[in-house]
């Protein structure tokens, strides 16, 4: 969902993915998410973000990848890789910290 | 209307792990604009975050309690699950799953009140 | 940890008073995303205002939010019986999550 004006400058960001309400949203930042489930195929999804900008600064996992930029319609064309599969002995937590 | 509803055992025993779970109706868990947080509160006295997880399986922890909690999502079963491991007396609590977006923490479950004793 | 301090830890009022509540915050608090909670014995937490100054869907409008920065206060224009109960700040948005220690508000 749009945020208030009084929350700061909003960017205009793409917006793709199952709980989109148009092509585009507005949020203090852009994202890009790329996940994968148990036993399915990577999912990318591009959207807003406006709490919580710790996840912007997670290592990528075997699961989960998060990207963050500022600027109008900067989520558009990244794509994302998540990384390769590891040894559970090396396996990182999805803990942003 | 989005419901949250925690289960799990009322009694868990010293050294043991803690485990709940929050159940979501009425709503997706895998939104992207929900945060679906643990938090607990000890008898008598105020509330501690415990902890966060995204629908991506993204997690942040309370560094107080990080090195003893797991939080997990499991979107097929809209639920998403915390474990506290080498539980103490002092882990004794009521605690609670919410919902946090924009709006800050709207949506609460009822609380389930975690006794620890041998 | 953007640490909480509510004040006054107790307040003692009458039915039909105005209570005054304070939420300091130790750093100042990101886009305004301070909420107040209410919270009655046996009962999980309830939002009252988010976002320092929204009300939350179906609080009564004699409760309002303001403030900016690190100063945040609850104000409940006209007390009515049933909003004798624990107050809590809190601050969202960031990791980690802090809660104030809460204002009990008593009937005088």
């Known amino acids: 969902d749009p945020v208030k004006p009084s929350r700061g400058p909003l960017v205009t960001c793409t917006c793709e993915s199952p709980h989109c309400r148009g092509p585009t949203c507005q949020g203090a930042w852009c994202t890009v998410v790329l996940v994968r489930e148990e036993g399915r195929h990577p999912q990318e999804h591009r959207g807003c973000g406006n709490l919580h900008r710790e996840l912007c600064r997670g290592r990528p996992t075997e699961f989960v990848n998060h990207y963050c930029c500022d600027s109008h319609l900067c989520n558009r064309n990244v794509s994302l890789v998540l990384e390769a599969t590891q040894t559970p002995s090396e396996q990182p937590g999805t803990d942003s910290q | 209307q989005v419901q949250l509803q925690e289960s799990g055992p009322g009694l868990v025993k010293p050294s043991q792990t803690l485990s709940l779970t929050c159940t979501v109706s009425g709503g997706s868990i895998s939104s992207n604009d929900y945060y679906w947080n643990w938090i607990r509160q000890h008898p008598g006295k105020g509330l501690e975050w415990i902890g966060y997880?995204?629908?991506?399986?993204?997690?942040y922890y309370n560094p107080s309690l990080k090195s003893r909690v797991t939080i997990s999502v499991d979107t097929s079963k809209n639920q998403f699950s915390l474990k506290l491991s080498s539980v103490t007396a002092a882990d004794t609590a009521v605690y609670y799953c919410?919902?946090?977006?924009?709006?800050?923490?709207?949506?609460w479950g009822q609380g389930t009140t975690v006794t620890v004793s041998s | 940890e953007n640490v909480l301090t509510q004040s006054p830890g107790t307040l003692s009022l009458s039915p039909g008073e105005r209570a005054t509540l304070s939420c300091r915050a130790s750093?100042?608090?990101?886009?305004?995303?301070l909420a107040w909670y209410q919270q009655k014995p046996g009962q999980a937490p309830r939002l009252l205002i988010y976002?320092?100054?929204s009300g939350a869907t179906g609080i009564p409008d004699r409760f309002s939010g303001s403030g900016s920065g690190t100063d945040f206060t609850l104000t409940i224009s006209r007390l009515e019986p049933e909003d004798f109960a624990v107050y809590y700040c809190?601050?969202?948005?960031?990791?980690?999550?802090?809660f104030g220690q809460g204002t009990r508000l008593e009937i005088k």
């Open positions: 976002g320092a100054s």
């Open positions: 750093q100042s608090v990101s886009s305004n995303y």
């Open positions: 997880i995204y629908y991506s399986g993204s997690t």
């Open positions: 919410a919902r946090e977006s924009t709006d800050g923490m709207d949506v």
């Open positions: 809190q601050h969202y948005g960031s990791s980690p999550i802090t």
